[in-house]
Amino acid sequence: HTVELNNMFGQIQSPGYPDSYPSDSEVTWNITVPDGFRIKLYFMHFNLESSYLCEYDYVKVETEDQVLATFCGRETTDTEQTPGQEVVLSPGSFMSITFRSDFSNEERFTGFDAHYMAVDVDECKEREDEELSCDHYCHNYIGGYYCSCRFGYILHTDNRTCRVECSDNLFTQRTGVITSPDFPNPYPKSSECLYTIELEEGFMVNLQFEDIFDIEDHPEVPCPYDYIKIKVGPKVLGPFCGEKAPEPISTQSHSVLILFHSDNSGENRGWRLSYRAAGNECPELQPPVHGKIEPSQAKYFFKDQVLVSCDTGYKVLKDNVEMDTFQIECLKDGTWSNKIPTCKIVDCRAPGELEHGLITFSTRNNLTTYKSEIKYSCQEPYYKMLNNNTGIYTCSAQGVWMNKVLGRSLPTCLPECGQPSRSLPSLVKRIIGGRNAEPGLFPWQALIVVEDTSRVPNDKWFGSGALLSASWILTAAHVLRSQRRDTTVIPVSKEHVTVYLGLHDVRDKSGAVNSSAARVVLHPDFNIQNYNHDIALVQLQEPVPLGPHVMPVCLPRLEPEGPAPHMLGLVAGWGISNPNVTVDEIISSGTRTLSDVLQYVKLPVVPHAECKTSYESRSGNYSVTENMFCAGYYEGGKDTCLGDSGGAFVIFDDLSQRWVVQGLVSWGGPEECGSKQVYGVYTKVSNYVDWVWEQMGLPQSVVEPQVER
């Protein structure tokens, strides 16, 4: 009879065990365990009748189609085998054990005691069949196994082979290389690869297989396993396989599909191809005169671009438009997108006008083309070029006039300072005790007229100032302070200020230049109580033209000592010139006993200590600060007076051979102007040079050469 066993383990014994088994008996045990397991069988006791080749009694172990072992007897001999310590393993999940005894037993035989168990199959070690083994990685577990793939691969639906996702490859460059996945390593199995070459219309794709070509094939059937097919429009080329690469293919199309198919077996290295776009050829190009074409090639095809540029000093001219370069392109119909332009010499055109300057052409016919040369010069003697620039400009390749130092910037013509058109006489008489100034003697002298219409009644006064540049006047702060009913320092409105330059006789202003004020700047620390920091600036609405009667004075170097004692300076003004009229009379009566013609006087600088002492001895709050110096004579007789305020006290600088403004008429008193031991007090300009330049918005270096050259 047959016994079916389905457990994972169990015991099998001969009939009647442990007693002797009966004669003429046959029992079959069919053991079935789940897939992924095999059956292990071993005997703990075995005692059967011996016979040649186990003809009488035996235990036979078999599978569906194979006898695994036949056992009998008690011990193994040449012709019979007992299991002993041997273990019988089924190759699969089924094992059949048959026990048979013949009709007679000479002795009592106790039979057998066997045990079985299901044991795991390690499929990863034991699968040798390529059709069944994992493509990349195998993972065993009790009762089964599974496969996995290397990075970049996907497990096929057969759960065994590893394929790649390669159906979405787009190539748009004009040249490129396409290979089978993992080339030159074997390509993946079970894969469908699609490569699309999509170029701009007008190009044609040429294909060439290179290096190794190794695709699984078959000796009789054309490419049944793995293959390449090339699809051009409706036409399909291929399939291709084997070890011989196809010849180069000219597709005559801008769009190509490459299909690569691999089945689930085989180890082949794959393929590599390069593709190249071909286009229509364009005619040969000739570079323009004075120009070149880049890149320079023997042949040009569709989509090739060339850049036309010109030699240094020439510009590309296309349709009357100048440019640095011009690009043309080979079109799909084999023509160029444009004609070759011409190269035209660069023209810097007419040079910019120089304020207070002239231009002379160094090149014949007043040429303004590349490498032409011009020279700027300033209107001498009233202006000179800043930093002694050469003024030479060359027409550059960029089409701009260039100077070696200034680049494309124009030079600056700075007003010459401190050089009157007439030389001042050495003999100077007595503004009290002064004399008439000849026109052009003090070309920096400015008359400042203030008419304050915001006051009731309207207030009108005047003072002097000194021209520093074409746009700026230096004067005393108290001249431009609103004549208020308190001691607050508020500047007069610029609308109330008029400046006269080149004026000689106040009765005849026709020859003078009159200008409105754009800005009135008082020194921020001007103190009405003691006239400390009595300095101010007026910016003119428009720059004034310089000439023999209108020229600036030079600013001094920054030196706290100021002018040396006993140095002689000149000061001019239209102030009170009559020594017999008192200041109080003028203030109270409103009479203007002023000079019509500009007066000037020569005065020595008084030692600071002497001046301080002279004022400290007086009643009233008179302080001579370090921002002031005094000038005049102990015996009096010569002095500046009311109305001369803000005028320049100038000293001739031997080093620069120029007149420098060292002082500004500030104050004096309380006795009358020109009184004995009443020195005129002047603002020490050298203490304010930085402040002046800052207000004028110019760096100090601009002026240094004027005074120190």
Epitope: S454, V456, R485, T487, G620
Partner: antibody, heavy 114, light 112 residues
Framework: QVQLVQSGAEVKKPGASVKVSCKAS????????INWVRQAPGQGLEWIGW????????KYNDKFKDRATLTVDTSSNTAYMELSSLRSEDTAVYYC???????WGQGTLVTVSS | DIVMTQSPDSLAVSLGERATINCKSS????????????LAWYQQKPGQPPKLLIY???TRESGVPDRFSGSGSGTDFTLTISSLQAEDVAVYYC????????FGQGTKVEIK
């Protein structure tokens, strides 16, 4: 013609602040200063401070410099005087004046009472 | 700080008579550079803002009757109404503008 028009009367509690305005017209606001003066009932004139609209310079009577703030808004030609930490003795008529006291506002009565 | 002291505190004058008010400063108001005395005189009538009469000690403001005159220099100043009119009844203040501003305590002028 020149006019200075001040804001209306105010009643404030001790410790509070008051801000009086003074709107100028008829002249260029930035060319002259604005002065503030006050007068307690039955008392004399007391100068508070001064502001110059062109550059916002200010000057104060030492007595008020910690409590008074003078400002201007040149876009509306208006000057302001703010007095903080009010006490009963700040009850007064507050005047603004311009063009060096040639023109005065009508005065603003500020009453400080609990 | 400059202190301004007016005298008398009040003054009763007959119509057409001269009225004189004095003002003394604690320091000189004469500015040596500008040669001006920074002193002003104001008139204030009840319920009205003050009115400027005199500045720089002696300069009459535009539109002020010439019966009003100012004098003095340094520290001592005087306002004179040469012939008192009914409309001149008011409180008169002096003010220094030499260093910031300070008012005198005021002088009340009445008709006798």
């Amino acid at each position: 013609q020149v006019q200075l028009v001040q804001s209306g009367a105010e009643v404030k509690k001790p410790g509070a602040s008051v801000k009086v305005s003074c709107k100028a017209s008829g002249y260029t606001f930035t060319t002259d200063d604005i002065n503030w003066v006050r007068q307690a009932p039955g008392q004399g004139l007391e100068w508070i401070g001064w502001i110059y609209p062109r550059d916002d310079r200010t000057k104060y009577n030492d007595k008020f410099k910690d409590r008074a703030t003078l400002t201007v808004d040149t876009s509306s030609n208006t000057a302001y005087m703010e007095l903080s930490s009010l006490r009963s003795e700040d009850t007064a008529v507050y005047y603004c004046s311009s063009l060096e006291d040639t023109y005065w506002g009508q005065g603003t009565l500020v009453t400080v009472s609990s | 700080d400059i202190v301004m002291t007016q005298s008398p505190d009040s003054l009763a004058v007959s119509l057409g008579e001269r009225a004189t008010i004095n003002c003394k400063s604690s320091q000189s108001l004469l500015q040596s550079r500008t040669r001006k005395n920074y002193l002003a005189w104001y008139q204030q009538k009840p319920g009205q803002p003050p009115k400027l009469l005199i500045y720089w000690a002696s300069t009459r403001e535009s539109g002020v009757p010439d019966r009003f005159s100012g004098s003095g220099s340094g520290t001592d100043f005087t306002l004179t109404i040469s012939s008192l009119q009914a409309e001149d009844v008011a409180v008169y203040y002096c003010k220094q503008s030499y260093n910031l501003y300070t008012f005198g305590q005021g002088t009340k002028v009445e008709i006798k």
